[in-house]
């Protein structure tokens, strides 16, 4: 853009250098050149000479008019054609921007991920504004009436150390830019009700070699929360539909869940938990893939366990190699079963 330019005159914009997208805009150029009575004044947008809607107001001033200006940014400058000069002479330049006032932030959610030491608040920002937009997060104690404010761009992490004086808060978000301000709805937060247990991990799975083979899935969490309610969803990799099993979990020991599954099929498992009776779920765990054994009961497969996966990581595939002598093939399989895509709470889907 044109940040610092030595002007030999002035350039100004009506209604202003930042305006609402779709507005009609007039840009004025006034020369103050020494030893020049310009024959013509020219306007350039992003380096290209403009041909239309230019009016010469008087000897020193011209105007260009744009109907429904809809570009987020443009670099304008104007020049003079001075008699006896081969080149045009620069008069002045301006950066101009158009955008929208912000939408009211919606779907405000605040959670505390266990052990994080922060309350994380997120919201939907609405349609793009195209101009600098800030979000002011207000956190007001319902017990002490003290209010804190935090500046954010799309989410905020507030240290729980600064939320020591109270358990109940009112949280809301203001979206601010030079074209306007909008408030979210207020969210009532009780710190004890928004804790999400530490990530749940499926560590391994095995299929027994019984007459009716059963698959045992082992899963764990480092949570200190005593009463935890969990869901495990599972499906074959070829299926679109998930089956869901529910569990009350006690993570003082590794959880074992039993499934009677189709033989010789590749299954995907994911687990998520919440504190019993609360509303905030963990995101689904990374998908764990397990191959059930053939009906004959021959165990020509090797379960391969998941590494530790952080809550926000992308999908990690689990594969079972046909033979332990084919490591290269195994690696290729692991790279092609799943494309990693970001976890997004309840909406993460596989397959």
């Amino acid at each position: 853009g044109i940040t610092s330019i030595n002007c030999s005159g002035d350039m100004w914009v009506e209604p202003g250098e930042i305006f609402q997208m779709g507005m009609n805009v007039s840009i004025y150029c006034q020369e103050a050149l020494k030893h020049c009575r310009p024959r013509n004044l020219y306007f350039y947008k992003n380096g290209f000479k403009e041909e239309f809607d230019i009016t010469r107001i008087n000897r020193t001033t011209a105007r260009i008019w744009y109907k429904g200006f809809s570009e987020p940014h443009a670099y304008m400058h104007c020049t003079a054609e001075c008699p006896g000069h081969f080149q045009e002479t620069l008069i002045c330049g301006k950066d101009i921007s158009s955008g929208h006032p912000p939408d009211a932030p919606s779907n405000l959610t605040c959670v505390i991920y266990e052990y994080s030491g922060n309350m994380t608040c997120t919201w939907n920002t609405g349609k793009p504004t195209y101009i600098d937009t800030k979000y002011i997060v207000h956190v007001k104690s319902l017990e002490t009436e003290e209010e804190q404010q935090y500046l954010a761009s799309s989410y905020v992490k507030i240290s729980t150390d600064s939320l020591q004086g109270s358990r109940k808060y009112l949280v809301w978000v203001q979206a601010v830019n030079s074209l306007g301000m909008e408030n979210s709805q207020q969210l009532h937060v009780h710190l004890d009700d928004i804790v999400i247990p530490s990530a749940s991990i499926i560590s391994r799975a095995e299929t027994t070699n019984d007459t009716v083979p059963k698959t045992i899935v082992y899963w764990k969490s480092k949570t200190m929360i005593e009463k935890v309610f969990c869901e495990m969803r599972y499906k074959t990799t070829t299926n679109q539909t998930w089956s869901v099993k529910e569990f009350d979990a006690n993570f003082t020991y590794v959880q074992q869940s039993e499934f009677y599954l189709e033989p010789d099929s590749k299954y995907v498992f994911q687990v998520r938990c919440q504190e019993t009776g609360k509303r905030n779920w963990q995101p689904w765990s990374s998908p764990f893939v397990h191959q059930t054994s053939q009906e004959t009961g021959k165990r020509n497969w090797q379960p391969w366990s998941s590494p530790f996966v952080h809550q926000t990581s992308q999908t990690v595939s689990q594969v079972t190699a046909k033979s332990s002598h084919e490591p290269q093939k195994m690696e290729m399989l692991s790279a092609t079963i799943f494309r990693g895509h970001p976890a997004s709470g309840n909406h993460q889907d596989i397959g």
């Epitope: 800030k134 404010q149 500046l151 954010a152």
Partner: nanobody
């Protein structure tokens, strides 16, 4: 840590003018998004004006066309020129330094009283 000190408040008749100043000290001032806020008795602390990162300025609807935010970088000082003051502009005025993800830091405030 930034310290902020407001001045320039006072009592004025409706239609009058005041110019508030806010002097900042501390080495993190350059990362501040500076704003002016006001709090009337029993009300929330509301944003009046804020300098945006793209060089533009936000003004609350209630002060548009009457208040002007300016800054003097060499002096680490921001100003709020308040013209055509109304009784409803009566409040404690604060300047604030906001940095992304951090708690907004306020000055002590300066009282503005507009009588009719």
């Amino acid at each position: 840590q930034v310290q902020l000190q407001e001045s320039g408040g006072g009592s004025v008749q409706a239609g009058g003018s005041l110019r508030l100043s806010c002097a900042a000290s501390g080495d993190t001032y350059s990362s501040c998004t500076m704003g002016w806020y006001r709090q009337a008795p029993g009300k929330e602390r509301d944003l009046v004006s804020m300098l945006m990162g793209d060089g533009s300025t936000f003004y609350a609807d209630s002060v548009k066309g009457r208040f002007t935010f300016s800054q003097e970088n060499a002096k680490n000082t921001v100003y709020l020129q308040m013209n055509s003051l109304k009784p409803e502009d009566t409040a404690m005025y604060y300047c604030g330094c906001a940095t992304l993800g951090s708690r907004t830091i306020w000055g002590q405030g300066t009282q503005v009283t507009v009588s009719s």
